[in-house]
Amino acid sequence: VPRWRQQWSGPGTTKRFPETVLARCVKYTEIHPEMRHVDCQSVWDAFKGAFISKHPCNITEEDYQPLMKLGTQTVPCNKILLWSRIKDLAHQFTQVQRDMFTLEDTLLGYLADDLTWCGEFNTSKINYQSCPDWRKDCSNNPVSVFWKTVSRRFAEAACDVVHVMLNGSRSKIFDKNSTFGSVEVHNLQPEKVQTLEAWVIHGGREDSRDLCQDPTIKELESIISKRNIQFSCKNIYRPDKFLQCVKNPEDSSCTSEI
């Protein structure tokens, strides 16, 4: 492939991106009665309008405002689960614990989950060859700005006790550069949020360390405390058992520490 077809360092727009977004929207609005009023064609038009014909390194949160407006959704503010570097388990959890919500359980998060997209300046074409990489090319790209925008709004909506699932297998359990660390933490509203409770998910079966004492968790506690929000932390030593107990809380083995 010639270099001019690889203008950016990241992968190109996901194949059949328009069809995928539209199909996901239709599916979501069918499953969620409170969103049945949403016109999926208008949602796609607004999504498209955010990045088509725009330089993929000059995207702003403002570009996504029409989409944000159409995708406005009320989720129970005290049932929010944030996550960092452990998406799959977070999603498995909310699939079982149906009254809790990750960002990807909302319409806008569901539409964009695992997709890549970008356009080109001054043309109506979607770029299926390559899109900007956050590190190698630019941070103000369509995908990064989208997630920054929806993540900020999601965090701003949270209240009471907010939960966050963190990956205990990573060298930085709490990473200031993650979306959680750079956006969500700073947009929790102290006047609404009482406590941030971190669930640190252990990877190894024999790992009995208290990862709540990890320096990066202490750093998170410090940031949260300075924002006048209380902080608590729990080790989830056995994520498989944890999920099983969410499914079957009456199970006798679920009284011990997970």
């Epitope: 010639p2 270099r3 001019w4 077809r5 203008q7 330089h55 080109e120 001054n122 043309t123 074409k125």
Partner: antibody, heavy 118, light 110 residues
Framework: QVQLVESGAEVKKPGASVKVSCKAS????????MHWVRQAPGQGLEWMGW????????NYAQKFQGRVTMTRDTSISTAYMELSRLRSDDTAVYYC???????????WGQGTLVTVSS | QPVLTQPASVSGSPGQSITISCTGT?????????VSWYQQHPGKAPKLMIY???KRPSGVPDRFSGSKSGNTASLTISGLQAEDEADYYC??????????FGTGTKLTVL
């Protein structure tokens, strides 16, 4: 050595079609995109489009969309450019040119003069 | 069909330096590093002189150099020689898998 040899001059009537061939040798034909560029008498160069000889994928300049078709036959390492509904202002020398990857054209055919006249 | 703007003609004496400009927009020249330059003698096919803005193919004298600033690319020929007299064209990638040529410049060696 790399060579691109184009077919001979053509005289066509308005409304007709012309198909110009470009035979490649001296390199792996499927490894490089092939572009077509034309030049009207006394005028500048005009980019028409490209074909990926490996996949057969094409992209044409907006001006020629609907009138141009680029194809290839990998078995004989030859690219083709067909232009239909010819008009007198399509009179030009048509060049094929190899793209080594940087959006530049490092080897060119000798050019095929297509004259459109009634 | 958008084209890149070049001066119609440029001239210089042997040994002198000349510069040919090629002005586009942020959608082509300014947006990418895929600008090339071609020399064309009468009745001949064009010859690649500069690619990717400033790189020289083997066999092209180092008297030929390319540069870019904003939406304008430039070809500079130093130590002008009689055989440099020809037409020169710039070409740029223009996004969406398309390319655009310049209007062409006739170089006369006085």
């Amino acid at each position: 050595q790399v060579q691109l040899v184009e077919s001979g001059a053509e005289v066509k009537k308005p409304g007709a079609s012309v198909k110009v061939s470009c035979k490649a040798s001296g390199y792996t034909f499927t490894g490089y995109y092939m572009h077509w560029v034309r030049q009207a008498p006394g005028q500048g160069l005009e980019w028409m489009g490209w074909i990926n000889p490996n996949s057969g994928g094409t992209n044409y300049a907006q001006k020629f969309q609907g009138r141009v078709t680029m194809t290839r036959d990998t078995s004989i390492s030859t690219a083709y450019m067909e232009l239909s509904r010819l008009r007198s202002d399509d009179t030009a020398v048509y060049y094929c040119a190899r793209d080594p990857g940087g959006g530049d054209f490092d080897y060119w055919g000798q050019g095929t003069l297509v004259t459109v006249s009634s | 069909q958008p084209v890149l703007t070049q001066p119609a003609s440029v001239s210089g004496s042997p040994g002198q330096s000349i510069t040919i400009s090629c002005t586009g927009t942020s959608s082509d020249v300014g947006g990418y590093n895929f600008v090339s330059w071609y020399q064309q003698h009468p009745g001949k096919a064009p010859k690649l002189m500069i690619y990717e803005g400033s790189k020289r193919p083997s066999g092209v004298p180092d008297r030929f150099s390319g540069s870019k600033s904003g939406n304008t690319a430039s070809l500079t020929i130093s130590g002008l020689q009689a055989e440099d007299e020809a037409d020169y064209y710039c070409c740029s990638y223009a996004g969406s898998d398309t390319f655009v040529f310049g209007t062409g410049t006739k170089l006369t060696v006085l």
